[in-house]
């Protein structure tokens, strides 16, 4: 049985979508800024029809490795999933490796495509630049995600976001639209546009198949 709750907002995305939130856990974001980032994720989740049938979500914090807090197959109430998203711990690490988290997304989250009818999107929230030695396979992972029909939407936040990587992601596919913001303060202003863009990329559920009409018998 699907665990659903009534919508919280007028705009409510009811599409077939597997959405992964990837949160930069580097010290380029202060703890306060990271809290704004989490609030943005929670706000977005409020605008999605989260369930195993409609929008499935995953939440991953990345630093030099990746830490999944929510998996696509987690069967929990939307309010509980939002609560878990709000509890993501601030790592404040020296490094946040986009290459590692895209590798994780490719080989762990989307290793098996169990919902081919749904769109697959990775929302990459990035505020830092990984060291060059870590980014050797970056393009390979982006291309691997493209092969698996995973759309990557980078959201660059602040002056240290890796614009070169953002442009490389955009180049890989026309759907890989980037949003570049000067600070976390702009997340709230951009939220509705980002949610609408994600939602438009996902298919609507096909109408339920009805049994063929029974022939009407008339008695003369």
């Amino acid at each position: 049985k699907d665990i659903s709750e009534p919508p919280l907002h007028d705009f409510y995305c009811s599409r077939l979508l597997d959405l992964v939130f990837l949160l930069d856990g580097s010290s380029r974001l202060s703890e306060a800024e990271f809290e704004v980032l989490k609030a943005f994720v929670v706000d977005m989740m409020e605008r999605l029809r989260i369930s195993q049938k409609w929008v499935r979500v995953a939440v991953v914090e990345y630093h030099d490795g990746s830490h999944a807090y929510i998996g696509l197959k987690d069967r929990k109430r939307p309010s509980e999933l939002r609560r878990i998203a709000s509890q993501v711990k601030y790592a404040g690490s020296q490094v946040a490796s986009t290459s590692e988290v895209l590798k994780y997304t490719l080989f762990q989250i989307f290793s098996k495509i169990d919902r081919p009818e749904a769109s697959r999107i990775a929302l990459l929230l990035m505020a830092s630049q990984e060291p060059q030695r870590m980014s050797r396979n970056f393009v390979r992972y982006v291309q691997g995600l493209k092969k698996k029909k995973v759309i990557v939407i980078p959201v660059g936040i602040g002056p240290h976001a890796n614009l070169k990587q953002i442009r490389l992601i955009e180049k890989q596919a026309p759907e890989n639209k980037a949003f570049v913001l000067s600070s976390v303060d702009e997340l709230e202003q951009q939220r509705d546009e980002i949610v609408s863009y994600l939602c438009d990329l996902a298919p609507e559920a096909p109408p339920p198949t009805l049994p063929p009409h029974m022939a009407q018998v008339t008695v003369g």
């Epitope: 703890e31 704004v36 709000s86 509890q87």
Partner: nanobody, 122 residues
């Protein structure tokens, strides 16, 4: 169990300043100020994080209110300047055990003070 004690409220003329204090009995990760104007809901004002001293301030008071912390005294301050009659409210200090809920939601915070009244007259 964390104990919180606030102080510093009072009556002030519009355009004036006040400094609220909130002392904690134990170590806290985040400390926030909320306020409840008469007949309205309790609303977020500001928060400070002990890990790096970073702060968030509500848009409605940005540029007028600042939150700061004295780690040695385990005390957080809310410096309020250019006060307006609309700032009249009971001000509460709060802290949380864990991070469950967004920073601006009251449900996140486990420990609260009884509140200190701030009245701004025109």
């Amino acid at each position: 169990q964390v104990q919180l004690q606030d102080s510093g409220g009072g009556l002030v003329q519009a355009g004036g300043s006040l400094r609220l204090s909130c002392a904690a009995s134990g170590r806290t990760k985040d400390m926030a100020w909320f306020r409840q104007p008469p007949g309205k809901e309790r609303e977020f004002v500001a928060v400070i994080y002990s890990s790096d001293g970073s702060t968030l301030v509500a848009a409605s008071v940005k540029g007028r209110f600042t939150i700061s912390r004295d780690n040695a005294k385990n005390t957080v301050y809310l410096q309020m300047t250019s006060l307006k009659p609309a700032d009249t409210a009971v001000y509460y200090c709060a802290t949380s055990r864990g991070y469950s809920g967004t920073y601006y939601s009251t449900s996140r915070y486990d420990y609260w003070t009884g509140g200190t009244q701030v009245t701004v007259s025109s």
